[in-house]
Interface confidence: low
Amino acid sequence: MGNSCYNIVATLLLVLNFERTRSLQDPCSNCPAGTFCDNNRNQICSPCPPNSFSSAGGQRTCDICRQCKGVFRTRKECSSTSNAECDCTPGFHCLGAGCSMCEQDCKQGQELTKKGCKDCCFGTFNDQKRGICRPWTNCSLDGKSVLVNGTKERDVVCGPSPADLSPGASSVTPPAPAREPGHSPQIISFFLALTSTALLFLLFFLTLRFSVVKRGRKKLLYIFKQPFMRPVQTTQEEDGCSCRFPEEEEGGCEL
């Protein structure tokens, strides 16, 4: 017991002696936050000059305060011991650690493209002032029907499946008996949906081709050379929405 007490006392003495020796050897260690160790003045602690700070003691220089200029606005003023903090002016929002960037806000129902805010295309929505337009939920994938149609600002609301809505159907639908695949209404509606989707795609690409012929090649090149940019659609002058192709939804197309 006495031995361990001796060890603790010895350690404390060593630490205290080290601290005293360190402060004798390095007077800068005595300089508190808000000051710096001034080599030009026999290493005395000088206050940080205006527009600078030191958040820790023993610093040989003060750091320049961050200036919230341009699209940035001051959230917290710089003090001698802490840096300024910025946020973004109205119409912009912060990005990055410590609000290192500001990005332009858009309205709900829009997304930010290379050149500004554009309306979400039909079939997509954005319920925030930032971020990209996302596709409406496909209710039929969960075997449900669309209860409330989607808008540019809101996703669709899925309701019970069409079968659940038939007269006399109980709220809990029992599993259907196995039937011949050829007779399943789900499969028939699936093939109908598939056919109409294919027709829509064909129509879309024919329209795209026509509009490219009309406007020249540059826009098409622009769409395909920027797989990650959410390109502005070719017919954007008419409907002013910013489209991504369905293949690009998952992060770009390889051409």
Partner: antibody
Framework: SLEESGGRLVTPGGSLTLTCTVS????????ISWVRQAPGKGLEWVAI?????TTDYARWAKGRFTISKTSTTVDLKINSPTTEDTATYFC????????????WGPGTLVTVSS | AAVLTQTPSSTSAAVGGTVTISCQSS????????LAWYQKKPGQPPKLLIY???TLASGVPSRFSGSGSGTQFTLTISDLECDDAATYYC???????????FGGGTEVVFK
């Protein structure tokens, strides 16, 4: 902040690369434009590089200039300078909108002369 | 390429007065509002005053205002101060097959 460098006296037909060094923000999220001003003339938009690396040039600048970037710098290469390229070159940072160049470097002077 | 025509090319003003600068584009700017106004002084980089045609940039006095849409835009500087002596430029952004570009500039000098 932004700072341009590389401006100097160069002979016509030589090659010159201007560098815009950025600090305090990421080029992964920001577009950088180059703009120039010849002595006694107005401002002229030269080129832009988007955060994705996509580039766009003024029509007159295509082929004459090449814009590229690393993680902290954006370079503008003047491929075969002529006396008309004598100007102060500025780089500017936009916020999601090309026309809105909020932060600028002080500029670097390029003189093309034989 | 679109042409941005600024008028007047030079204007003489009095302290406390008002100056109006016009910027006309030969084609509609992107989204009808992709136009910015800059102040340029010798030896200094341009300074953004107005963006999206009418939005005041941060730290810019409310004496500066922008208006217009499509092809016709205006910068108005009221209660002029000596420090406003500079050249003012509009910058238009266009669809992808048209160059972005500055107007020719308007020099504001004091009587």
């Amino acid at each position: 902040s932004l700072e341009e460098s590389g401006g100097r006296l160069v002979t016509p037909g030589g090659s010159l690369t201007l560098t815009c060094t950025v600090s305090g923000f990421s080029l992964n999220n920001n577009a950088i434009s180059w703009v120039r001003q010849a002595p006694g003339k107005g401002l002229e938009w030269v080129a832009i590089i988007q955060n994705t690396g996509t580039t766009d040039y003024a029509r007159w600048a295509k082929g004459r200039f090449t814009i590229s970037k690393t993680s902290t710098t954006v370079d503008l290469k003047i491929n075969s300078p002529t006396t008309e390229d004598t100007a102060t070159y500025f780089c500017g940072r936009g916020y999601g909108f090309e026309s809105e160049l909020v932060i600028w470097g002080p500029g670097t002077l390029v003189t093309v002369s034989s | 390429a679109a042409v941005l025509t600024q008028t007047p090319s030079s204007t003489s003003a009095a302290v406390g007065g008002t100056v109006t600068i016009s910027c006309q584009s030969s084609q509609s700017v992107y989204n009808n509002n992709a136009l910015a106004w800059y102040q340029k002084k010798p030896g200094q980089p341009p300074k953004l005053l107005i963006y999206l045609a009418s939005t005041l940039a941060s730290g810019v006095p409310s004496r500066f205002s922008g208006s217009g849409s499509g092809t016709q835009f205006t910068l108005t500087i009221s209660d002029l101060e000596c420090d406003d002596a500079a050249t003012y430029y509009c910058l238009g952004v266009y669809n992808d097959d048209v160059d972005n570009g500055f107007g020719g500039g308007t020099e504001v000098v004091f009587k």
